[in-house]
């Protein structure tokens, strides 16, 4: 059974992940982002179901394309400059949260999503899990 300290740790990690995802979303929605139109053409895979921490496998699998789409917007006028580090940090948190004991085969929805829809989906996921922990 999860202890209060492990629950607290999970909550903190989810909050960190939530902040990172929100930071990316705010960055790409920045009016100074000249590549937003282009970024919105990329199709991301969305989870069919995302209600448990193990479903973060579906986010992990899309982190590389997310990094490469975000790379498009790296410029002095756009503040998401250390994309690689940011994605790497997210990856570390995701691996810790989902656990590595069981490798889940991610099930994706038939419909793909834009980067904005994709980020919003995972932001909602974090908020939902956090609310069950508090």
């Amino acid at each position: 059974a999860p202890t209060s300290s492990s629950t607290k740790k999970t909550q903190l990690q989810l909050e960190h992940l939530l902040l990172d995802l929100q930071m990316i979303l705010n960055g790409i929605n920045n009016y100074k982002n000249p590549k937003l139109t282009r970024m919105l053409t990329f199709k991301f895979y969305m989870p069919k179901k995302a209600t448990e921490l193990r479903h973060l496998q579906c986010l992990e699998e899309e982190l590389k394309p997310l990094e490469e789409v975000l790379n498009l917007a790296q410029s002095k006028s756009f503040h998401l400059r250390d994309t690689k580090d940011l994605i790497s940090n997210i990856n570390v948190i995701v691996l810790e949260l989902k656990g590595s004991e069981t490798t889940l085969m991610c099930e994706y929805a038939d419909e793909t999503a834009t980067i904005v829809e994709f980020l919003n989906r995972w932001i909602t996921f974090c908020q939902s899990i956090i609310s069950t922990l508090t």
């Epitope: 282009r38 053409t41 990329f42 895979y45 699998e61 899309e62 394309p65 490469e68």
Partner: antibody
Framework: QVQLVQSGAEVKKPGASVKVSCKAS????????INWVRQATGQGLEWMGW????????GYAQKFQGRVTMTRNTSINTAYMELSSLRSEDTAVYYC???????????WGQGTLVTVSS | DIQMTQSPSSLSASVGDRVTITCRAS??????LGWYQQKPGKAPKRLIY???TLPSGVPSRFSGSGSGTEFTLTISSLQPEDFATYYC?????????FGQGTQLEIK
């Protein structure tokens, strides 16, 4: 880490068929297309076609239409390219490459040399 | 089908030189162009995608520019390991098509 490992070199007679495999690891096989590209000795790169491992959908260059078949086995994360009615000018190194929309071909197999000789 | 024309087909340069390779598309391909480096006996390696974006791990001396039908790959200061053949690839529509290649040799 992402890897595409291809089958070994083949020697075939004119008129025969060859089937090259490309085993993917280190990523979700169905999330990326597999493209096939060939290169004759001392020549440039030539795109042959693509396959979406998720749907099985394919698209072939006009030059290879009717002679090439691209398939996959998702249970073993492997893509295949079969070229039939081989002729000497099909002697080349055949590469598989992973691609997704406008990200280009980010990972390539090591190449498979196919020699067509009587 | 879209034709990709690369120039020059070969180029001699010295370590430290600035080098530019051009690729021209037969029709508008927006920013849907990649650049690849190939060394003898090896598979090609992606250097640039979406005309100007560097994947992680590619040295910053490589840069890409252009859109529509005219594209360039620039190596700001040639290093010994950069002597290779370079190809452009349009990933705007099917069939995909490569340029004929530019062989970069040591002067």
């Amino acid at each position: 880490q992402v890897q595409l490992v291809q089958s070994g070199a083949e020697v075939k007679k004119p008129g025969a068929s060859v089937k090259v495999s490309c085993k993917a690891s280190g990523y979700t096989f169905t999330n990326y297309d597999i493209n096939w590209v060939r290169q004759a000795t001392g020549q440039g790169l030539e795109w042959m076609g693509w396959m979406n491992p998720n749907s099985g959908n394919t698209g072939y260059a006009q030059k290879f239409q009717g002679r090439v078949t691209m398939t996959r086995n998702t249970s073993i994360n492997t893509a295949y390219m079969e070229l039939s009615s081989l002729r000497s000018e099909d002697t080349a190194v055949y590469y598989c490459a992973r691609g997704r929309q406008w990200l280009g071909f980010d990972y390539w197999g090591q190449g498979t040399l196919v020699t067509v000789s009587s | 089908d879209i034709q990709m024309t690369q120039s020059p087909s070969s180029l001699s340069a010295s370590v430290g030189d600035r080098v530019t390779i051009t690729c021209r598309a037969s029709q508008d391909i927006e920013h849907d162009l990649g650049w690849y480096q190939q060394k003898p006996g090896k598979a090609p390696k992606r250097l640039i995608y979406a005309a100007s974006t560097l994947p992680s791990g590619v040295p910053s001396r490589f840069s890409g520019s252009g859109s529509g039908t005219e594209f360039t790959l620039t190596i700001s200061s040639l290093q010994p390991e950069d002597f290779a053949t370079y190809y452009c690839l349009q990933h705007n529509s099917f069939p995909r098509s490569f340029g004929q290649g530019t062989q970069l040799e040591i002067k």
